[in-house]
């Protein structure tokens, strides 16, 4: 997946620093207080959909083949989304106000692709 | 996830019949020749992003919190994408022209959500 570097408008991964204090989640998340979560942005021209590493590869590739031939679904926009996310350990208060440490999936965007 | 029924413009699953013959893939895919692969379409207003069943839940929820507060990344569109895909068995010619049967992931869109 591409890294956003200011020189491309194609689907890429933008570094993004998340601070739980800014969104008021520091009242239940103990650690980390912040981390690089990143996000995906950019355009998804037809040729980028369904390439290796793209989201839901087989299905995306099939739908893209339909689009390239001018067949339905032609109006659905291809979308720049996370294709690889990673897990991070988090220390937080659970529903019963116990402090717990858990591996939380889908916290960090590692790669982006066109769905 | 919502099913598209012609009455909603929100992110939903649209039934879609895929015929490999129409895209010229019948030269390597033996069976099935066609199937319901479906696709996702519709709008993703802010309140729909990061709800249970949406894509990449934790990360989506965090980014959505930033957006709701007018913080970056505010310009990135939320996107209606598959949140649940299923596997299907496929009989096809491999690289050495042997006929093989495999479970192919991500063939069928089962549910859609906002990323």
């Amino acid at each position: 997946g591409l890294e956003c570097d200011g020189r491309t408008n194609l689907c890429c991964r933008q570094q993004f620093f998340i601070d739980f204090r800014l969104i008021g989640w520091n009242d239940w998340i103990i650690a980390p207080t912040s981390y690089y979560g990143n996000y995906c942005e950019g355009s998804c021209p037809a040729y980028l959909a369904g390439v290796p590493g793209s989201a839901s590869s087989f299905h995306t590739a099939v739908v893209n083949q339909y689009r390239m031939r001018g067949l339905n679904p032609g109006t659905v926009n291809s979308c720049c989304i996370p294709t690889k996310l990673s897990t991070m350990s988090m220390l937080y208060f659970d529903d019963e106000y116990n402090i717990v440490k858990r591996d939380v999936p889908n916290m960090i965007v590692e790669e982006c692709g066109c769905a | 996830g919502l099913e598209c029924d012609g009455r909603t413009n929100l992110c939903c699953r649209q039934q879609f019949f895929i015929d490999f013959r129409l895209i010229g893939w019948n030269d390597w895919i033996i069976a099935p020749t066609s199937y319901y692969g479906n696709y996702c379409e519709g709008s993703c207003p802010a309140y729909l992003a990061g709800v249970p069943g949406s894509a990449s839940s934790f990360h989506t929820a965090v980014v959505n919190q930033y957006r709701m507060r007018g913080l970056n990344p505010g310009t990135v569109n939320s996107c209606c994408i598959p949140t649940k895909l299923s596997t299907m068995s496929m009989l096809y010619f491999d690289d050495e022209y042997n006929i093989v049967k495999r479970d192919v992931p991500n063939m069928i869109v089962e549910e859609c959500g906002c990323a």
């Epitope: - | 019948n26 069976a31 099935p32």
Partner: antibody
Amino acid sequence: QVQLVESGGGVVQPGRSLRLSCVASGFTVSSYGIHWVRQAPGKGLEWVSVIWYDGRNKDYADSVKGRFTISRDNSKNTVYLEMKGLRAEDTALYYCARDKTGDFDSWGQGTLVTVSS
Amino acid sequence: DIQMTQSPSSLSASVGDRVTITCRASQNINSFLSWYQQKPGKAPKFLIYDASSIQSGAPSRFSGSGSGTDFTLTISSLQPEDFATYYCQQSYSSPFTFGQGTKLEIK
């Protein structure tokens, strides 16, 4: 309902030819793969050949490759097995069967081929 | 080619018995295994596919399990009409191959 009926079997001398037919009803052969499977007297099942959905792709067991040819006539909803250079070891009950992604979900009653001098 | 080996080759049992037939593949075939029942003078009948999915119309006393190389067909309570020969078959790759069969006889 789905039905497959084989015909064309009989007694034939070694080296001679025979053509088996498999007439389908209840479905169209152009939408399914059709296999031939044989069973020698008192023995197990042996896959012989298949003609796939598009009619272009065909496959054969090594034991019959170069001698047997599978074909299809969509207008007659029929699949054929042309058998040339028959040998004693080809003696068997020949079944046609409908494909279900490499499995066989419907079978005919079979037609007996006896190769004997 | 993938070799399929069934055991036992023959088996005697009584009505009401629980019976298990095994099938072993010479290499990993995931769960792409089917079972067929054949009665004397009749064509085989499709019973189970994908190792454990029961074919429409097959009695629920038949069940299948296994993946990789080792598979079993189980009849939970033998009925008089179940005495027949059973074949396993792999659909993982062509040529599609059968086991040699297991003949189930009345004790």
